[in-house]
């Protein structure tokens, strides 16, 4: 019996093939056990981690991972050369920059070496799985008596990223947030000089170079306000 099971996980064009064997008895072999799903994330297009839940196996199993790129010059099957481990059992594979081709369909295959027919294959669009590093070098400029401008840097192509800015004062219970496009600049037009403000930013690889759903980590926060603004009223970039 050869079945194809679709396992959508928020990444389009994702398929998993599970190979099952029919048994003469009522009991089914280990081949029927589904393999864990592989989740891949590309970190700032510097390396990629593809991981699985090794504890979902009924007994500790060193699953193996192979990969290739569909319909491309890179369609030769490659073995994982750098496994990640969890309690001495394989739980992932790390691919280096030169092995990452964002805009080709990435095919990843997980296999049980003790039961070679027990394997699962997924196809992933890596441009939708990029997670950039957190924004850095946040700076605040006072444009006028009541207007602040927040700037930051990213260690990636500016136009590939969108951003989310959050800010609040010490008097606020929740964050106010604002989406910012690739220009990575945010202005707060009305600032209360009596309050202390905290700002933070995160970034996402969307929509111009890919369609990633996951945000970066938050930047280190930056503060502005009553007890700090007297020191330098025009520029302040102290991190918490």
């Amino acid at each position: 019996l050869n079945t194809t099971i679709l396992t959508p996980n928020g990444n389009e064009d994702t398929t998993a093939d599970f190979f099952l064997t029919t048994m003469p008895t009522d009991s089914l072999s280990v081949s029927t056990l589904p393999l864990p799903e592989v989740q891949c994330f590309v970190f700032n297009v510097e390396y990629m981690n593809c991981t699985w839940n090794s504890s979902s196996e009924p007994q500790p199993t060193n699953l193996t991972l192979h990969y290739w790129y569909k319909n491309s010059d890179n369609d030769k099957v490659q073995k994982c050369s750098h496994y990640l481990f969890s309690e001495e059992i394989t739980s992932g594979c790390q691919l280096q920059k030169k092995e990452i081709h964002l805009y080709q369909t990435f095919v990843v295959q997980l296999q049980d070496p003790r039961e070679p027919r027990r394997q699962a294959t997924q196809m992933l669009k890596l441009q939708n799985l990029v997670i950039p590093w957190a924004p850095e070098n946040l700076t605040l400029h006072k444009l006028s008596e009541s207007q602040l401008e927040l700037n930051w840097n990213n260690r990636f192509l500016n136009h590939c990223l969108e951003h989310l800015v959050q800010y609040r004062t010490d008097w606020d219970h929740s964050w106010t947030e604002q989406s910012v496009d690739y220009r990575h600049k945010f202005s707060l037009p009305s600032v209360d000089g009596q309050k202390r403000y905290t700002f933070r930013v995160r970034s996402r690889f969307n929509p111009l170079c890919g369609s990633a759903q996951h945000w970066s980590e938050w930047s280190h926060p930056i503060h502005w306000g009553s007890n700090t603004s007297k020191e330098n009223p025009f520029l302040f970039a102290l991190e918490a």
């Epitope: 297009v45 491309s72 964002l102 805009y103 080709q104 441009q127 192509l157 690739y182 111009l208 170079c209």
Partner: nanobody
Amino acid sequence: QVQLQESGGGSVQAGGSLRLSCTASRFIFDDSDMGWYRQAPGNECELVSTISSDGSTYYADSVKGRFTISRDNAKNTVYLQMNSLKPEDTAVYYCAAEPRGYYSNYGGRRECNYWGQGTQVTVSS
């Protein structure tokens, strides 16, 4: 931060030559496919030429045989040598950087203002 900086534009007679340069920050240049776009007043942003990180190139039909793109990885710089210039080459030229493989496998229209300020090229007849 300014990630791409163009230079080398100017005014020239038809038939003349110019060489545009674009310098990128190291972390941008190393893993990017680089390209040149142009935009004339009232026109859309037009892809002129690209060079991938492995050195393969693309040219728009309108510039084939006249323009040459190259990259100097040691200097983080991409060049556009423009020969036999025509009045219709008059535009603001923008240097662009894309994730590796973008041009050959993904594509999609771009706005010229995604990148720097550009450099003006004016060709008079």
